[in-house]
């Protein structure tokens, strides 16, 4: 094919691929009709000038994962047809100021994952057709405020994984067509008011993994087309009133891994398209009434790994389409009987690793579609009669790692569990913690004899009376052999369904980092 270099492969479609560590300089001669050239995983360290003079038809040049550290001025001369240029994953520390002057029809320029320490003001001045600029994964600490002034056609700009500590409020003022802006994994501590005001077409804004402490109240007010907003893993301690009021198109919002202590009612303004809200790993201590009332299409709400001690009965008002609620790993001791009343479509609820001592009998009264309830690792000693009776879809109930008190009051729960054992899964069943004569025995299969004294085991140290547990000598193997005396129909029989155990860190859904 017009003299394909031996180190390369050339296709009839005018595509040339050169790869391999043995390549230390650009192979020559390259086919004059080449339209796509890929030079990947080589040991090429520099691009001299006039390198591509004889392949002026080139549209795409991909030079990735090489050892490039030097590009001479004029290296891209005669590539006026080039639309796509990738120099990603090389070792470029600086770029000559006019290095791109011969490729002014570029639509995509990828400079990511190099070692660039600065961008010159005029570096991108001729790129009026540029749609995509990738600068992530470099060592940039600042960018001249006029650097992007001429990129009026830009739709995607990635500045993530650099070392920016601040942004000029006018940096993006000419980027009215921008749809995706990524600033994640930098060192931004605050973002000046007005920084995003010109970005009326922005659909995605990635600010996660910075050091942002405060958000200006009107920071996003001009971004009415925003669909995805990533604010996770920052130092945000509060959300200003109205911060999200002008975001009617938002469908993804991540706020996990911040320092939020409270959520004022209405802070999540009308967002009819928001499906998921990730708030885990904050310091939220309580939830007020109507905190989420504008989010009537929300399906997933993750509040795990906070410090919740109180949830107001109306906190979840308006969440009529919620499917999954994760409240695990908090400090909840008690729940109001009406707290889940408005969650008519809830399917999964995770309440494990709290301090729940008891549950109201009607806690799940209006939540008829529940399929999964995680209550493991709490302080539960018993559960009210009939608490699960109406949950005909329940197929996974986790009750282990609770200090169940297996006295006469446990019989209704015991009987229900006998009839619905498959709902508990197969690997981990709840066991009795007290009295001492039945400690360690399965709550499901234990035989309990009432009335009568506890069966005493051999002498062992007194068990501490923490909390609300009488002191009984501890035994490891004493079993009671007498029969259950109460009726089995204290709990209504439910259709048994096999359940599997899945111990996900954040709840029922894998956490997404944005």
């Amino acid at each position: 094919y017009y003299g394909c270099p031996s180190e390369c492969t050339c296709s009839r479609a005018s595509q040339v691929e050169c790869t391999g560590a043995r390549i230390v300089a650009m192979p020559t001669p390259l086919p004059w009709n080449a339209m796509s050239l890929q030079v990947v995983n080589t040991h090429i360290t520099e691009l001299p000038e006039n390198l591509f003079l004889n392949i002026s038809a080139l549209i795409a040049l991909k030079m990735e994962k090489n050892e490039l550290s030097t590009i001479m001025p004029g290296a891209f001369r005669n590539l006026g047809s080039l639309r796509y240029l990738s120099l990603a994953n090389n070792k470029l520390r600086m770029l000559p100021i006019r290095v791109f002057q011969d490729v002014n029809n570029l639509e995509s320029l990828l400079l990511s994952n190099n070692q660039l320490v600065q961008i010159q003001p005029a570096q991108f001045s001729q790129f009026s057709n540029l749609r995509e600029l990738q600068l992530h994964g470099n060592n940039l600490e600042s960018i001249p405020e006029e650097a992007f002034d001429h990129l009026v056609g830009l739709t995607k700009l990635n500045l993530g994984r650099n070392s920016f500590t601040h942004l000029s409020p006018r940096l993006f003022q000419h980027l009215g067509n921008l749809q995706v802006l990524r600033l994640h994994e930098n060192r931004l501590s605050d973002i000046p008011m007005g920084t995003f005001d010109a970005l009326g077409n922005l659909q995605e804004l990635a600010l996660q993994e910075n050091q942002i402490g405060t958000l200006s109240p009107g920071l996003f007010h001009n971004n009415r087309n925003l669909q995805r907003l990533y604010l996770s893993n920052n130092h945000i301690s509060q959300l200003p009133p109205g911060i999200f009021m002008q975001l009617p198109q938002l469908n993804k919002l991540t706020l996990f891994g911040n320092s939020l202590r409270e959520l004022s009612p209405g802070v999540f303004g009308p967002m009819p398209n928001l499906r998921e809200l990730w708030l885990y790993n904050n310091h939220i201590t309580s939830l007020a009434d109507n905190t989420f009332s504008h989010l009537n299409q929300l399906q997933v709400l993750i509040l795990s790994h906070n410090q919740l001690t109180y949830i107001s009965p109306g906190a979840f008002n308006g969440l009529t389409n919620l499917r999954e609620l994760s409240l695990h790993t908090n400090a909840l001791q008690d729940l109001d009987s009406n707290v889940f009343r408005s969650l008519a479509n809830l399917q999964n609820i995770s309440l494990q690793s709290n301090r729940l001592r008891q549950l109201p009998g009607s806690i799940f009264a209006n939540v008829n579609g529940l399929t999964t309830i995680q209550l493991q690792n709490n302080n539960l000693e018993n559960l009210p009669l009939g608490i699960f009776d109406h949950l005909v879809n329940l197929c996974e109930l986790r009750l282990y790692d609770n200090p169940w008190r297996c006295d006469s009051d446990i019989l209704p729960l015991h009987n229900w569990l006998l009839l619905n054992r498959a709902r508990l899964g197969t690997d981990t069943l709840p066991v009795c913690s007290s009295p001492a004569n039945v400690r360690g025995q399965s709550l499901v299969i234990i035989n309990i004899n009432f009335p009568g004294p506890s069966v005493q085991g051999p002498e062992t140290p007194e068990v501490p009376s923490y909390p609300d547990t009488p002191s009984y000598p501890d035994t490891t193997s004493v079993s009671s052999t007498t029969e259950i005396t109460s009726a089995v129909d204290d709990y209504t029989d439910l259709t048994t369904i096999e359940a599997t155990d899945d111990r996900n860190t954040w709840g029922m859904t894998e956490a997404q980092s944005g």
Partner: antibody
């Protein structure tokens, strides 16, 4: 009589690994959460990790997350701490401790005597 | 959550009333315990849930407080009480200890 006996400590180079064990007796092991607490020489107490009675819930202090793994074998009445990518600042006496309940609480009524882990080149 | 004990050390005589405070950087309800440790020994649980006396611990030990401010009181110091005392919060992961308060014999 409740007894907790730690083992597995010793001298290890930075980046190395150790596995601590804690053999428990005298109580119904599976019905109590267990924890590891460490104490650097001449310093205060530092909570490391906790595991619930079944082993279904585990938690760690931030500095060991991703490096240490707590586990338990309820059939053998043994608690473990797998320690990888060890650093000099992990040097301490490591105590295993029995919680007062099956769920993860920070109240420990019985403690072992500790095993010394030294991380040094 | 940061726990700050005060004082860091104190000297007292047998029979004295001793008070040690523990302040938390965030509200932790009553999810706090107190431990005693003697040199070369493992710690010993004295108080759980801020004010509940652990079984077998002498009644001269008492705990109080809720929210962010907690107190351990020894009503009448005994010779065996000379030790270092630590508070521990288990309201929020990671659980954290205070830096300790050393109670020494007044010379």
């Amino acid at each position: 009589q409740v007894q907790l006996l730690e083992s597995g400590g010793g001298l290890v180079q930075p980046g190395g690994s150790l596995r601590l064990s804690c053999a428990a007796s005298g109580f119904t092991f599976s019905t109590f959460a267990m924890s590891w607490v460490r104490q650097a020489p001449g310093k205060g107490l530092d909570w490391v990790s906790v595991i619930s009675g079944t082993g279904g819930s585990t938690f760690y202090t931030d500095s060991v997350k991703g490096r240490f793994t707590i586990s338990r074998d309820n059939s053998e009445n043994t608690l473990y701490l797998e320690m990888n990518s060890l650093r000099a600042e992990d040097t301490a006496v490591y105590f295993c401790a029995k919680a007062v309940t099956v769920n993860t609480r920070g109240f420990f009524d019985y403690w072992g005597q500790g095993t010394l882990v030294t991380v040094s080149s | 959550i940061v726990l700050t004990q005060s004082p860091s050390s104190l000297s007292a005589s047998v029979g004295d009333r001793v008070t040690i405070t523990c302040r938390t950087s965030q509200v932790i309800r009553n999810d706090l315990g107190w431990y005693q440790q003697k040199p070369g020994k493992a710690p010993k649980l004295l108080i759980y849930d801020a004010s509940s006396l652990q079984s077998g611990v002498p009644s001269r030990f008492s705990g109080s407080g809720s929210g962010t401010d907690f107190t351990l009181t020894i009503s009448s110091l005994q010779p065996e009480d000379f030790a270092t005392y630590y508070c521990l919060q288990d309201n929020n992961y990671p659980w954290t200890f205070g830096q300790g308060t050393k109670v020494a014999i007044k010379r």
